[in-house]
């Protein structure tokens, strides 16, 4: 099973969690691929960006994404953890001024141009099997993760910890 437990249990705490600092604690430039090694690519089409999940040709260069890590503090009355109830939230930016956004109504993942401070839809809770294999949970919709559906990124509801091992919500980060 993947490293997340009791997803539903923390729904309210996740909604109430707050980013503790306006600046990221660290930033990391990486290429993003699926658990099955398909690349996540970004293409400018008709003045907007499209996101694709595809097999790259042998020497084709992978697109890079800037992951900005933020600390998020659970309110102590929710988590019972006091100051120790911290999560990592990330924003993902493949190109200047554009960020991945969760569109919960359409269950889609979109690239939006926006200014800081970023909206909550641009923040994802980082879960990891290990540092190079991660999942991204919507801050605005706990239990919903970025996943792969029909060669596109989509929002996928994970309703129990048995479903958390599903490969379609797992992503690999790499420097190459």
């Amino acid at each position: 099973a993947f490293g997340i437990s009791g997803v539903q249990k923390y729904t309210r705490a996740l909604h109430d969690s707050s980013i503790t600092g306006i600046s990221p604690i660290t930033e990391y430039l990486a290429s993003l691929s699926t658990y099955n090694d398909q690349s996540i690519t970004f293409a400018l089409e008709d003045e907007s960006y499209e996101i694709y999940v595809e097999d790259l040709k042998k020497d084709e260069k992978k697109d890079k994404v800037l992951l900005s890590y933020y600390e998020s503090q659970h309110p102590s009355n929710e988590s019972g953890d006091g100051v120790d109830g911290k999560m990592l939230m990330v924003t993902l930016s493949p190109t200047k001024d554009f960020w991945l956004h969760a569109n919960n109504k359409e269950h889609s993942v979109e690239l939006h141009k926006c200014e800081k401070p970023l909206p909550d839809q641009a923040f994802f809770v980082l879960h990891n099997m290990h540092s190079n294999c991660v999942s991204f949970e919507c801050k605005t919709d706990p239990g919903v993760f970025i996943g792969v559906k029909d060669n596109h990124l989509a929002l996928i509801k994970v309703d129990s910890s048995e479903n958390l091992c599903t490969e379609n919500i797992l992503f690999k980060l790499s420097e190459t």
């Epitope: 490293g3 437990s5 604690i25 911290k86 999560m87 099997m129 290990h130 190079n132």
Partner: antibody, heavy 121, light 106 residues
């Protein structure tokens, strides 16, 4: 207040087994990765094993693979290290540690005081 | 596997000195680096995480910096209570500690 209390250490002969326990309190145990780290007398720190928050993924130092097993009981807020086929080079203080963030394998935010394991005939 | 090499292995300095400890990784670790302090007879304690973030309750005389393969822990004004062994630790790929730097007062 976060507390991690290790028990189960002691003197054991080479080839025998020992099971370490670490009881956690003061935080939502099931949200965190847990770890075992050891330190041989007078030496540095060595990561031994990791377990993710629901217990489904485990990782081991190469030299203990196949001999040590990490497990956890989230209902009882306890993480275990079952150590079989012990060798003299396993002699160390074994520390239990908790991840720094919910759901994440980054950093050891809190440590127990350690339990000493001595493997000797 | 990523190897972490710390230098020097022992550092002697006077109270009030600015002290710099070095940690070198065998591969790029993307700032996935912590520093831990261990005093004699005690468990280690997290000082700095993700290269430059000070853990709650740690004095501001401690700071971290670095990127790629080279990282530094600085104590801006060494205090008697800073006598300890300091370990760097990477979690970019697997989990690996450096061998430690022992800080002493002259």
């Amino acid at each position: 207040e976060v507390q991690l209390v290790e028990t189960g250490g002691g003197l054991v002969q080479p080839g025998r087994s020992l099971k370490l326990s670490c009881v956690a309190s003061g935080f939502t145990f099931s949200n965190y990765w847990m770890y075992w780290i050891r330190q041989a007398p007078g030496m540095g720190l060595e990561w031994v094993s990791s377990i993710n928050n629901d217990g489904g993924n485990t990782y081991y130092l190469d030299s203990v693979k196949g001999r040590f097993t990490i497990s956890r009981n989230n209902a009882e807020n306890t993480v275990y290290l079952q150590m079989n086929s012990l060798r003299s080079e396993d002699t160390a203080t074994y520390y239990c540690a908790r991840g720094h963030y919910y759901y994440s394998s980054y950093s050891f935010g809190s440590w127990g005081q350690g339990t000493l394991v001595t493997v000797s005939s | 596997d990523i190897q972490m090499t710390q230098s020097p292995s022992v550092l002697s300095a006077s109270v009030g000195d600015r002290v710099t400890l070095s940690c070198k990784a065998s591969h790029n670790i993307n700032k996935h680096l912590d520093w831990y302090q261990q005093k004699v007879g005690e468990a280690p304690k997290l000082l700095i995480y993700f290269t430059n973030n000070l853990q709650t309750g740690i004095p501001s005389r401690f700071s971290g910096s670095g990127s790629g393969t080279d990282y530094t822990l600085t104590i801006s004004s060494l205090q008697p209570e800073d006598v300890a062994t300091y370990f760097c630790f990477q979690y970019n790929s697997g989990w690996t500690f450096g061998q430690g730097t022992k800080v002493e007062i002259k």
